[in-house]
């Protein structure tokens, strides 16, 4: 139940936030139990845990990844869950924090000396509200690749968007994820829908560049709900 | 900048119910997590509900089977309907936007809140 999650050791000893969020560097963070969170112009202290409900990890922050809470626990609550550092245990690379990956069971530094040569990903999709993969199974990917200090450029393997160079993000492409770029005004975006999750994308599409979001053409208003085209413009 | 605005508040009887409404904006609505929060007088603010962009909800046990938290994408508007209203309900109630995650360049996902709107069950 929620109640024994919010009340479990795994979520009250949550390392707190490392710093304020990307970009708004005014964000200010304190240990726990009192967190200071941006609330528009003012910041707030909250003094309990905040439960960020998730289907996938790209719904958490870059330190987050999307999880059960509780070892066992009901599958279908999945909450955003601080990453792991070196050397702590991990079932998929998303678990652990940028700059690691996950190997044996344990997160590891992707530093140069740690990580060159094949890593593996397994990389389970979600289509849909059902959790089911595109043909019921788990997708393995062996992934080759040479993983350096410097960003990854555009077409480079990644795990993650900090793995890619400034104006990249990591997105799917066929089962593996490459460093593809941030979407500029005018371009066509994808529109995730609150109802039916992310769907089948195979091929990802970033998102929308600063200062941007992915909103209805204005000349498709008339179009039908299916056929609407979706580019990224000015807030 | 965003800016949400609760509304549905009120006085009710216990066994009663409300439906309390958010209205966003300032933010890409469909992308966003929206949540409820709430505090009673002396107490700490805790967690109600929330509904994420890929429409999964989460509850806490208090409210679970009473409470149901919706978004309409259309309106911009997240909704919390809350039925069976107990006195332990009472509590000044604020809507919450999830602030998008890595997708927005946070590093974590947090909410930002609204002002609030009480709710008083009472007989």
């Known amino acids: 139940t929620l109640n024994s999650v919010l009340n479990s050791n795994a979520i009250k000893n949550l390392p707190p936030p490392l710093g304020g969020a990307a970009g708004h560097p005014g964000s200010a963070v304190s240990a726990a139990p009192g967190i200071l969170y941006p609330g528009g112009n003012k910041y707030q202290t909250i003094d309990n845990y905040q439960p960020y409900p998730c289907a996938e990890d790209e719904e958490c922050g870059t330190d987050e990844y999307c999880a059960s809470p509780t070892r066992g626990g009901d599958a279908g609550v999945q909450i955003c869950l601080a990453c792991r550092k070196r050397r702590k245990r991990c079932m998929r690379h998303a678990m652990c924090c940028p700059g690691n990956y996950c190997k044996n069971g344990i997160c590891v530094s992707s530093d140069q000396n740690h990580f060159r040569g094949e890593i593996e990903e397994t990389i389970t999709e979600s289509f849909g509200n059902d959790h089911s993969t595109l043909d019921g199974y788990s997708r393995r990917t062996t992934l080759s690749s040479k993983m350096y200090h410097t960003k990854g450029q555009e077409g480079s393997v990644c795990l993650r968007s900090s793995d890619c160079a400034s104006g990249l993000c990591c997105a799917r492409h066929f089962w593996s994820k490459i460093c593809k770029p941030v979407l500029k005004e005018g371009q066509v975006c994808t529109k995730h829908r609150r109802k039916g999750s992310h769907g089948l994308e195979i091929f990802q599409r970033c998102y929308c560049g600063e200062g941007l979001s992915c909103r209805i053409q204005k000349d498709h208003h008339q179009a039908s709900n299916s056929s609407r085209l979706h580019t990224c413009q000015r807030h | 900048e965003v800016q949400l605005v609760e509304s549905g508040g009120g006085l009710v009887q216990p066994g009663g119910s409300l439906r309390l409404s958010c209205a966003a904006s300032?933010?890409?609505?469909?992308?966003?997590?929206m949540g409820w929060f709430r505090q009673a007088p002396g107490k700490e603010r805790e967690f109600v509900a929330a509904?994420?962009?890929?429409?999964?909800?989460l509850y806490a046990d208090s409210v679970k089977g009473r409470f149901t938290i919706s978004a309409d994408n259309s309106k911009n508007t997240a909704y919390l309907q809350m039925n069976s209203l107990k006195p332990e309900d009472t509590a000044v109630y604020y809507c919450?936007?999830?602030?998008?995650?890595?997708?927005?360049?946070?590093?974590?996902?947090?909410?930002?809140w609204g002002q609030g709107t009480l709710v008083t069950v009472s007989s």
């Open positions: 919450a936007a999830g602030n998008g995650g890595r997708a927005y360049g946070y590093s974590r996902a947090r909410y930002e």
């Open positions: 300032g933010i890409p609505f469909s992308t966003r997590t």
């Open positions: 509904i994420s962009s890929g429409a999964t909800t």
